[in-house]
């Protein structure tokens, strides 16, 4: 368990031409506030969980009223740290998101409205319990300048806050296989409590309830001897039962050095040996410059000689971000078809089809009509996701089953009769009408409302609509 | 489960209005946040704005700044964006989203946040 705080060091226009609007004014003043969302591993846009590692929402800021014509200069800040607790291990790995918003304190019905002036996102590497970490990132017009850390909570210790440290019971020493828990030289590592029955010699675990091997033995409990050829370690206590040197754990177990850097043991305790762009203890330390080479998936840096002066990442195809750390939507590209929905999952595409339609992307239209007979004539016809039956004339329903009345919608105009036909249906017209349903007046002249009546009809006997 | 269903969109001429809906069903929408988010082709989904799942506060991204509102009618179960002042940027498939998180302050405007989508409703914005 531990916590991980940021400090919001200023938030204003970035470098370059086109600085912001100030987002307050006389009418209308503000204060800014800041959320954090942390998420394990690299990608933040990850489907996991809401906030997964965990969330935090700052204090507002003081009220900041614009001096008219004045820039917008790096606006007032909430006092204090955005504290996210995590109750598990620390991932090392993580992606952030932080959201600055804006609340307006005018006049609003229902409370001041918010608004979303910026988001920046990216993913890092840390390991709890190292010194403050700084970064800039840019969004739009304005940039946000920041320190993070993650720092394990009592008793917890260690690059992940998994190991576990205890006051002495001894003044001079740790009990056997246990070491100092350095910075607190006073304590020691404390066991943790792993699975039932693990061999106390010969497993230990870095999580409760695991059991996890010493090098030459196994088994679900590391009560197995694998070979007496492992039992050709340099170091380590006894065992009581073979007569084997069983490693013990040393300075280097679990590699405390983070951000790939490799560790070699020294005579009081273990040394980092950092890649580029990485110091400190245990090579924890970003100072975010293009030294530190802060683009990431092969972005290339440019500006940032110091830790003060901004730097930019030229992002390759296929990525984007002010660090290159955001792979571009692929659901831009509009993969799903027939009006399905795209969710880019970070590690796959999925598409949710709408009704009727199937496949990874949508592609397949699923035969509503597969398995369905339209009686008497009818033809199957698909769509939606439900199939519908085009009847033959003189029948209807959902599969062309009911015998159709054709004068049931009252077709026949002006008080014409209807008649049903074998070939549809008949509009006998009220005098003074005429046309297939009867929807035309005869005029006094004996002319109609038609160019001429069809040949061998009269108005006003019975047409036959076909 | 909850469905989400947006309705309202179409062509509209540079500086006319539109108002979209957003009817769900399911279960009691006055526990979400409604939200909306809008895609153009070959863009990122953009958080848009809409209104929180505790107290019902508008939340909105800068850009539509003074043009959309948002608000809702607990009692039919939907949302409305109203967008006046349209310019061809806004031209994009507009989606409706939901979820219970966060509890407290502004709606996420990360599109991973919200659970619950609609299929979106197309937005035209041309002379």
């Known amino acids: 368990a531990g916590v991980f705080e940021l400090q919001i060091h200023s938030f204003g226009p970035g470098p370059g031409p086109g600085a912001p609007r100030s987002p307050c004014s006389a009418r209308l003043p503000c204060r800014l506030f800041f959320r954090v969302c942390l998420k394990p591993g690299l990608s933040e846009e990850a489907a996991e969980s809401p906030c997964a590692l965990g969330a935090a929402l700052s204090a507002r800021g003081p009220v900041y009223t614009e001096q008219p014509g004045a820039p917008a200069p790096d606006l007032p800040l909430p006092d204090g740290l955005l504290q996210v607790p995590f109750r598990d291990a620390w991932p090392g790995t993580f992606s952030f998101i932080i959201e600055t918003w804006r609340e307006e304190l005018g006049d609003q019905i229902g409370g001041p409205a918010w608004s979303l002036l910026a988001r920046v996102a990216g993913r890092r590497r840390l390991a709890a319990g190292g010194p403050w970490a700084r970064d800039i990132q840019r969004a739009g017009a304005w940039e946000l300048r920041f320190s993070y850390r993650a720092r394990c909570e009592p008793p917890a210790v260690g690059t992940a806050c998994t190991r576990l440290c205890r006051p002495r019971s001894a003044p001079s020493r740790c009990g056997p296989g246990l070491r100092p828990c350095a910075p607190l030289e006073d304590e020691c590592e404390a066991p943790l409590v792993c699975r039932a029955g693990c061999s106390p010699e010969h497993g230990f675990c870095e999580q409760p309830g695991e059991c996890r091997c010493l090098e030459g033995w196994t088994g679900p409990l590391c009560t197995v001897p694998v070979s007496t050829s492992s039992c050709l370690s340099p170091r380590g206590p006894s065992s009581a039962t073979t007569g084997c040197l069983v490693p013990g754990p040393g300075p280097c177990d679990g590699n405390p050095c983070a951000n790939g850097g490799s560790c070699s043991e020294t005579p009081r305790s273990f040394e980092c040996t950092c890649p580029r762009g990485f110091y400190g203890l245990r090579c924890e330390v970003s100072g975010v410059t293009c030294a530190d080479g802060p683009c990431f998936n092969g972005g290339l840096c440019v500006g940032g000689a110091d830790p003060d002066s901004a730097y930019i990442c030229h992002c390759p195809p296929g990525f984007q971000g002010s660090n290159c750390e955001k792979r571009v939507d692929r659901c831009s590209l509009q993969p799903c078809r027939n009006g399905g929905l795209c969710l880019d999952l970070g590690h796959a595409l999925r598409c949710r089809c709408r009704a009727g339609f199937a496949g990874p992307r949508c592609e397949h239209d699923l035969d509503d009509c597969a398995g369905r007979a339209c009686a008497n004539g009818g033809t199957c016809v698909e769509g939606g996701g439900a199939h519908r039956c085009s009847c033959a004339l003189g029948f209807g329903g959902r599969d062309c089953r009911e015998r159709a009345d054709p004068c049931a919608a009252r077709p026949c105009a002006h008080g014409g009769r209807c008649y049903a036909h074998f070939s549809g249906l008949v509009c006998a017209c009220a005098p003074g009408y005429m046309g297939a349903r009867c929807e035309f007046p005869v005029h006094p002249d004996g002319a109609s409302a038609l160019p001429a009546a069809p040949p061998g009809l009269r108005p006003g006997d019975p047409q036959r609509y076909l | 489960e909850v469905d989400l269903v947006e309705s309202g969109g179409g062509l509209v001429q540079p500086g006319g209005s539109l108002r979209l809906s957003c009817a769900a069903s399911g279960r009691t929408a006055s526990r979400y946040s409604m939200v909306w988010f809008r895609q153009a082709p070959g863009q990122e989904r953009e958080f848009v704005g809409g209104n929180s799942a505790h107290d019902g506060r508008s939340a909105y991204t800068d850009s539509v700044k003074g043009r959309f509102t948002f608000s809702r009618d607990n009692a039919k179960n939907t949302g409305y964006l109203q967008m006046n002042s349209l310019r061809p940027d806004d031209t994009a498939v507009y989606y409706c989203?939901?979820?219970?998180?966060?509890?407290?302050?502004?709606?996420?405007?990360?599109?991973?946040?919200?659970?619950?989508w609609g299929h979106g409703t197309q937005v035209t914005v041309s002379s």
């Open positions: 989203a939901a979820d219970t998180n966060p509890p407290y302050g502004p709606p996420w405007s990360t599109p991973s946040e919200y659970e619950y």
